[in-house]
Structure formats: C-alpha cells, structure tokens
C-alpha cells in the first residue's frame, strides 16, 4: 500500500518539476517593447508577452499529453495572428493614404488648370514640386515603417522557431514521463494484486486462528470440568488427609510417651546419658551420607545459622547426593518473580521451584561445589552440562555466578555467559543491556545482554515451543528460539 502511494507522489513531483522548468524558460523571454522614432511620428510595437498567471491551477492538465503543444504556445500563435491583422490594417491604411494623396493631387491639378493664368505657371510648378517632395517623403517614411515591420516579423519568426524547439523538447519530456507513468501504473497494479493476494492469505489465516480459538475454547471447557472433578477429589482428599493427620498426631503422642518412658528408665539406669542432639544437614550430600538414600524433600539448614529451607534431594542420579536448586517441568509455577522471591526461593520442591539465591550463595562459599544442568527437549532427547566449580557471590555483589570447567553433551561452549554475570530480576536490573532482559525475556537469570541462556523463561507447551525469544533457552544445545520441556539445576560438593 505504501509503495503505491510513494510511486504516485514521485510521479506528480516529476511532472511538477518539468512544468516549473518550462515556466522559467518562458519567463526569461518576458515582455519585449520596440519603439521607432521617425520625425514627429513615433511608432511603438508591442511584441506578445507570455502570460504565466493564466495557466491551470493544477500543475499538470490531464489531457495535455494528447495536445500538440502546451497552452502557452497557443497563446503565442493567437497573438501573432493579431499582429498580422494589425500589419494588414496598417498596409491598407498606407494604401488608402497613397490613394488619398493621388486623388488630392489630381483635383488640385484640375483646379490649377482651370483657374490658372499664364503668369502663375511658375507658382504651380513650385507647388507641384512641393507636393512631389512631400509624396516622396511620405513614401520614404512608409518604406521605413515597412522595413521596421519586416524586422519585427523576422524577430517574431525567430522567437516562434525557438518556441517550437522548446515545445518539441517538452513534448519529448512529456512522452518520457508518460511512459514512466505507465511503468509505475504497471508496478502499482502488480503491487495491488500482491496486496489483494496477501489480504486473501490473511483472511485464510484469520479463519484458521478462529478455528484454533474455537478448539481451545472447547479444550478450556473440558479442562474446567476436569478441574471441577479434581476439586471435588481434593476436598475428599483433604477430609481424608485431616483424618490421617489426626491419626498421625495420636501416633506421635504415643511414640513420644513411649520415648519418654524409655528415656526415664534409661536415665534411671545410666544418669550420664546426654540428650540426643538434633541432627541438621547443610545439603543433600550430607543427607545421603547420613543414610537417607531415597529421593525426596529434606529440610536443610543455612550454614552457621538455625534458618531452615526445604529442598528436593536427588539420591539416584550420578551417584546421588544432589541438591536441586531449580526445576522446570510443566509450567505450573510462575518464574517471573521479584528479587526477594529469587533470594529466598519459591515454588514447590516436589515440582517446579527455585531453591533461593541466598542459601545457594552461602552454601557454595563454604566449600567447592559442582553444578550439573540436566535438560530435556520435546523430541525425547536429553543432555547435560557439568561445571566442575560453581559458586554465587553474595547479595551485595548481586549473586554473580562463577563457573569453571565445562563438560557434557549440551554444547561445547557454555550457554551461561563467561565470565559470569550478576543476577537480574524484573525489579532488579543488573544486566549489561540498555534494555531490561528480565522484563523482556521474563524470569530471573544471570543475563548478559541478554545472553545465550535463560532456564527461568516462559514455559511453552509442545508445538508452541519454537521461535520463542522468551522461552526456556539453552542456546548451545537447541539454538535461540527453542523452548525446552524440562530442566533441572543441581549442585553437589566437588569431593563427594
């Protein structure tokens, strides 16, 4: 559409420019005035003037292409005809003058002959001579005037020739422009066809989108009914759960009573037995070494603190003892969170969650840890990246990531930019881009500008996971637009 408009405009501009040049050449001729002084008589000839004001208000008259010459040329021809008429009138007037003189002379001669006396012959001869002289003088004057007129006519002919040359030039320009206009019209019609084709395509696409929407609505209503059923089941489960909790509470009370009884009897036997210390674990490796070798959620304690955190421990993969610090698997948890939330952690340790930057920072600054990132795509493939040394700086340094020694199957180059970057969230912009990567790509991550990875991006389901700039990305395995199906980030002491 815009191309068409552009061509139409340029076409008008070309014509307007040509027209203005033509007007300038006409203006340079201007109004010429010739004055001839002869005796007591003065003859003034006004040559025709080019009148620019009367041209059409439109810069280009639509039918001008079909004309033999521009409008100004017609004016010139008309003015020349007027001049020729004037000259013809002059000639007739001169002839009348001659006739009048001749008639007068004849009359005077007859009178002289009738009234003359012999002795007046000399006077009469003198008068005759004077009249002849006067006639000769008049004839000379007429000859001069004729010469002047001839002169002007020659000049006009020259100007006319010049005009016809410039007219030819203009005609050629107009013809060129006409062919240019035809070309542009062809181009326009081609573009119009293209636009129409695109419109048709667009209508088809809209139709398919509408169909998809209808299908989705059906799906949504199905899901709603499923959700309703699940809610009912949850209510039942909750009731059952509360019953179980009560039973568990009763059991615990019984166990505690038994323990109290046992400890009472034991202390009676041996008063030196100390109260058993509460065991706390810093990470899943310690949990594993204490004999708990099943996967699940365990309570970990911050180093040098009583503060606790719940984490999922993978006790099977690669020898076990892995503390899961991030998991994505189904899009059930929103990862577009605040700095505070990424600091303390969020989500559900048994499903999608982020363990918490503060805990990971404190943990990884106590001893050397390895980081393993396990990835799954939508085609059933799996890959991993293993960093032999990983730690996070403190919050004061924006939890900057530090990584060394990459191995694994998810790309030979690290998809987490090296050297490590500061952590950024939607409300804590610490990246190297003038944009705000976390706001643009969603999720908190160690963005560069914005970098080749973001495992906390938007979760896209299958068949919607390609060409996504803000998805779950690990560039050196799947490229920039591919959003992964599942990711797990896990840490373990290097000396495990």
């Amino acid at each position: 559409m815009w191309q068409i408009v552009f061509f139409t405009l340029s076409c008008d501009l070309v014509l307007a420019a040509a027209y203005n040049n033509f007007r300038k050449s006409m203006d340079s001729i201007g109004k010429k005035q010739y004055q001839v002084q002869h005796g007591s008589c003065s003859y003034t000839f006004l040559l025709p003037e080019m009148d620019n004001c009367r041209s059409s208000s439109s810069p280009y008259v639509s039918n001008a292409v079909q004309r033999d010459a521009p409008l100004e040329y017609d004016d010139s021809v008309q003015r020349l005809q007027v001049l020729e008429n004037i000259m013809e009138n002059n000639t007739q007037w001169l002839m009348k003058l001659e006739n009048y003189i001749q008639d007068n002379m004849k009359k005077e001669m007859v009178e002289i002959q009738q009234n003359a006396v012999q002795n007046q012959t000399a006077v009469m001869i003198e008068i005759g001579t004077n009249l002849l002289n006067q006639t000769a003088e008049q004839t000379r004057k007429l000859t001069d005037v004729e010469a002047q007129v001839l002169n002007q006519t020659t000049r006009l002919e020259l100007q006319l020739l010049e005009h016809s040359l410039s007219t030819n030039k203009l005609e050629k320009q107009i013809l060129d422009q006409t062919s240019e206009i035809n070309k542009l019209q062809d181009k326009n019609s081609f573009l119009e066809k293209k636009v129409l084709a695109m419109e048709d395509k667009h209508i088809i696409q809209l139709q398919s989108i509408k169909e998809e929407k209808d299908q989705l609505q059906v799906l949504v209503s199905k899901q709603n009914s499923i959700i309703e059923e699940l809610e009912k089941k949850i209510v039942t489960a909750t009731v059952n759960n509360s019953v179980l909790q009560k039973q568990q509470h009763d059991l615990m009370e019984t166990v505690n009573n038994l323990l109290t009884m046992m400890s009472t009897s034991n202390s009676a036997k041996d008063p030196t037995v100390a109260k058993e210390e509460q065991i706390s674990f810093r990470d899943c490796a310690e949990v594993f070494k204490s004999g708990h070798t099943t996967n699940g959620i365990y309570t970990l304690t911050f180093p040098n603190s009583t503060e606790e955190i719940k984490a999922y421990c993978d006790m099977e993969a690669g020898g076990g003892g892995w503390t899961i610090i991030q998991r994505r698997e189904d899009g059930s948890v929103d990862f577009q969170r605040t700095w505070k939330e990424y600091k303390v952690g969020f989500g559900n340790p048994s499903g999608e969650y982020w363990l918490g930057n503060e805990f990971v920072s404190q943990l990884t600054n106590q001893q050397r840890y390895v980081l393993k990132i396990h990835l799954k795509d939508w085609e059933g493939n799996e890959a991993y990246s293993l960093y032999e040394h990983f730690y996070l700086s403190s919050e004061e340094l924006n939890y900057r990531i530090h990584l060394k020694g990459l191995t694994g199957t998810a790309g030979k180059i690290s998809s987490i930019s090296q050297p490590g970057n500061d952590f950024s969230t939607k409300d804590g912009d610490n990246d190297k881009c003038i944009c705000k990567c976390s706001q643009m790509l969603t999720g908190g991550w160690w963005f560069d500008a914005c970098g080749p990875s973001n495992l906390n991006g938007m979760y896209y389901p299958q068949r919607q996971n390609t060409n996504k700039f803000n998805g779950i990305k690990w560039y050196y395995w799947k490229g920039s637009g591919y959003s992964l199906k599942a990711t797990t980030m896990m840490i373990r002491p290097a000396d495990f």
Partner: antibody, heavy 120, light 108 residues
Framework: QVQLQQSGAELVRPGTSVKMSCKAA????????IGWVKQRPGHGLEWIGD????????NCNEKFKGKATLTADTSSSTAYMQLSSLTSEDSAIYYC?????????????WGQGTLVTVSA | ENVLTQSPAIMTASLGQKVTMTCSAS???????LHWYQQKSGASPKPLIH???NLASGVPARFSGSGSGTSYSLTISSVEAEDDATYYC?????????FGGGTKLEIK
C-alpha cells in the same frame, strides 16, 4: 531527600470509588517499589499491595483483590490507588511507602497518609 | 499468610527502665526480612530497625533488635519520654507482607 506527598482527605459516599495519589520526589521513581498500607483505629497496619513503576508490576494482598487498583505514572513520578465499592470498613488512613527491590530496609520512607471517610 | 503476634499489646515503663517486646511468627521468617517501625500518635510510621538488628538512620543506640526463625524481639535499654509510641514488627516470607498488631509503650 526522599519525599512522598499524598493527596488530601476524602469524604465519600458508600458504593462509590476514590482515587488517591502519592507523588514521589528525591529519588529515581522507577527503581523502587511503592507500597500501600491501611490503618484503621484499633486494627493496626495492613499491607494492601505494592507496585514497581519500572515495569508496572504489582503484588496484591488477596484480601484487597477487587477492592484496590494500583497504578503509577512515571512521567509525573506519581503512584495511585483506587478503592472501589466503598463501605464503612474502608474508612481508614491510607499510607504510601517506598522500599528497595531487595527490601533489606523494609518500608524506608512513608507518606503523611490520606484519610478516607465513607459516610452516607 | 504468616501471622505476626506482638506481646504485650500495651506496656507501661518508667524513664530509664529497660523494656523488651516480642514478635512471634506463625511460620519461619528470614532475618533479612524482619523489620520494626515506631509510630507516634497522629504521625506516620517510621523505620526503627531493619533486617532484625540494624538500626535505621537517626535511631538512638538504646534501641536494639534480635531473633531468628519465628521469634524476634525489640529492646529499649533505657526508656526516654520520646519513646512513647506504638511499635510494629513487619515480615516478608512471601506475599503478603504482614504487620504485628503492635505494642503500645506508655511512659509513666
């Protein structure tokens, strides 16, 4: 220094809405969260929600969802809170407050408060 | 939500006396996100202590804070007349932020 200037007291009819403002000065408006706190006599302080003007993000106390709408105009460095379907329960002093995104210092700065009285 | 319970609700102290008020959380709170505010009659609340034990600017050294997990406290080593106010604890362990009901300190 940091200043949070709140709009004047409002006397409103039940069922209507009220929109109060909090004009910030002395800091970069888009870098800090603006929170809103309600105080009723004998009820202590209640957090309504907060907004991050740098992206228009909001967090809201479930209790005030449907009641409070938080907005911010970065061009005038002003945060707004609109309360709808007012009842006598909404008669209170409403404070705006500022906090760093890390929130290490809590609500570091407070406005002078806007008194809203809902009465027929 | 994490409910904060302050005790006592009202306390009376003599000038120069040491007073301690407590704030108990229904679930664990990170010490980074436990703060105290002072509100004098007819005024807006003002920050007193942030991150459990750090004094806000301009706060006298007679104020101190401590605690971890679910139990936190605020202590005034030697009460002065200007300390007549209501003191609120506030936490963030995930949304929503919550405040305690307040402890009103009256000076004899």
């Amino acid at each position: 220094q940091v200043q949070l200037q709140q709009s004047g007291a409002e006397l409103v009819r039940p069922g209507t809405s009220v929109k109060m403002s909090c004009k910030a000065a002395g800091y970069t408006f888009t870098d800090y969260w603006i929170g809103w706190v309600k105080q009723r006599p004998g009820h202590g302080l209640e957090w309504i929600g907060d907004i991050y003007p740098g992206g228009g993000y909001t967090n809201c106390n479930e209790k005030f969802k449907g009641k409070a709408t938080l907005t911010a105009d970065t061009s005038s460095s002003t945060a707004y809170m609109q309360l709808s379907s007012l009842t006598s329960e909404d008669s209170a002093i409403y404070y705006c407050s500022r906090s760093d995104y890390r929130n290490d210092e809590g609500f570091a700065d407070w406005g002078q408060g806007t008194l809203v009285t809902v009465s027929a | 939500e994490n409910v904060l319970t302050q005790s006592p609700a009202i306390m009376t102290a003599s000038l120069g006396q040491k007073v301690t008020m407590t704030c108990s959380a229904s679930s664990s709170v990170s010490s980074s996100y436990l703060h105290w505010y002072q509100q004098k009659s007819g005024a807006s609340p003002k920050p007193l202590i942030h991150r459990t034990s750090n004094l806000a600017s301009g706060v006298p050294a007679r104020f101190s804070g401590s605690g971890s997990g679910t139990s936190y406290s605020l202590t005034i080593s030697s009460v002065e007349a200007e300390d007549d106010a209501t003191y609120y604890c506030q936490q963030w362990s995930g949304y929503p932020y919550t405040f305690g009901g307040g402890t009103k300190l009256e000076i004899k």
